[in-house]
């Protein structure tokens, strides 16, 4: 069952997945001056067994001033720094990829990709968030945002993640922070 | 379901203690925090401050530092909110709501009435 | 804190009309603002968060737009049901503040 909604924003942090859960579908978006190879798939499924996932088809991007179609080969180095939305990695991630079973890890780049990627999220599927830079988070309560079905509707729970910049910090007494670690699991709110 | 579920209303004497409790249900108490707003009588929503269940940190909007706090007990799913010496202005009506941003559920409110 | 302002403070009009309440915030919020009603003896119900994104379960009819300072909730067409007060609220920062309220009566 695909997530109606994109997960939820929160002022001043991002969110990335860890790992997508089977039935994520990833469209196959080209930059600028580029397009879909034409019969090419319109986007990645991720798929499996209960043993192994993987990503079924490959995305491909040819330029659109040509009449040729390009093959898909490792991307150029500078070709991966243009993507904004997988560079979020490791300090956030909380398990390893391969270790979940029925998830994928994150596709590598194709060439000539877009910059941004469009996902199509899955019930269960599990964002994580971290404060953009320049805000740091209040306590390191729960982080993570989960599309859940209620009601017969998806939704996404709230993060409760809240980041905070140096001055607003500084100007905002009454912090106390006492030693007692915070549950770090998400929320699970009771369907009716 | 999710609720918020706010003890009674309270009438008080200027300088006695008092302590208003919420009661959350149908969601996952400890990790989501709680957040307190104040009504007076006829005015508008003053914003008091947050605790996060989970852990007990707690955040006090500058006007409401030093005059009340904020607590909570995640084994029963229930966020206090208290005064040691409670004056004639803090007569009003309080709500606990669910945040820390858009506040989607809201307890009934508390009316708080302090006079001599 | 960040100040948020709205206008007007009171506001007659009648079952059909279309109206619009506005709330100026003090700095940008980018769209981290949300929308209540209150009716007497009550507390207030989300109505819209994100500036334009409608809670679930709230009609239609209301509908909330603006980025940065200025931001709106409109009415499409009034319901006697409508006639409330109706706060804003930023949450850009966590210290959140609402707006002193517009109350909606029976012209």
């Known amino acids: 069952e695909l997530c109606d909604d994109d997960p939820p924003e929160i002022p001043h942090a991002t969110f990335k997945a860890m790992a997508y859960k089977e039935g994520t579908m990833l469209n196959c978006e080209c930059k600028r001056g580029f397009r879909r190879i034409k019969s090419g798939s319109l986007y990645m499924l991720c798929t499996g067994n209960s043993s192994h996932s993987s990503w079924d088809n490959q995305c491909q991007c040819t330029s659109s001033a040509t009449r040729n179609t390009t093959k898909q080969v490792t991307p150029q180095p500078e070709e991966q720094k243009e993507r904004k939305t997988t560079e979020m990695q490791s300090p956030m991630q909380p398990v390893d990829q391969a270790s979940l079973p029925g998830h994928c890890r994150e596709p590598p780049p194709w060439e000539n990709e877009a910059t941004e990627r469009i996902y199509h999220f899955v019930v269960g599927q599990m964002v994580y968030y971290q404060c953009v830079q320049g805000y740091r988070a209040l306590h390191r309560g729960p982080a993570e945002s989960v599309c859940k079905m209620t009601h017969g509707k998806t939704r996404w729970t709230q993060p409760q993640l809240i980041c905070t910049g140096e001055m607003e910090t500084s100007q905002f007494p009454g912090e106390e922070k006492p030693q007692a670690s915070p549950e770090g699991r998400p929320e699970s709110e009771t369907s009716c | 379901e999710v609720q918020l579920v706010q003890s009674g209303a309270e009438v008080k004497k200027p300088g006695e203690s008092l302590k208003i409790s919420c009661k959350g249900s149908g969601y996952s108490f400890s990790n989501y925090w709680i957040g307190w707003v104040r009504q007076m009588p006829g005015k508008g929503l003053e914003w008091m401050g947050i605790i996060s269940p989970g852990d007990s940190t707690t955040k006090y909007s500058p006007s409401f530092q030093g005059q009340v706090t904020f607590s909570a007990d995640k084994s029963t799913s229930t966020a206090y909110l208290q005064w040691s010496s409670l004056q004639a202005s803090d007569t009003a009506m309080y709500y606990c709501?669910?945040?820390?941003?858009?506040?989607?559920?809201w307890g009934q409110g508390t009316l708080v009435t302090v006079s001599s | 804190d960040i100040q948020m302002t709205q206008s007007p403070s009171t506001l007659s009009a009648s079952v059909g009309d279309r109206v619009t309440i506005t709330c100026r915030a003090s700095?940008?919020?980018?769209?981290?603002l949300a929308w209540y009603q209150q009716k007497p003896g009550k507390a207030p119900k989300l109505l819209i968060y994100?500036?334009?994104s409608l809670e679930s379960g709230v009609p239609s009819r209301f509908s909330g737009s603006g980025s940065g300072t200025e931001f709106t909730l409109t009415i499409s067409s009034l319901q006697p049901d409508d006639f409330a007060t109706y706060y804003c609220?930023?949450?850009?920062?966590?210290?959140?503040?609402f707006g002193g309220g517009t109350k909606l009566e029976i012209k």
């Open positions: 994100k500036a334009s």
């Open positions: 709501v669910r945040g820390p941003y858009y506040l989607d559920y």
């Open positions: 609220q930023q949450y850009n920062s966590y210290l959140l503040t």
């Open positions: 700095q940008s919020i980018s769209s981290w």
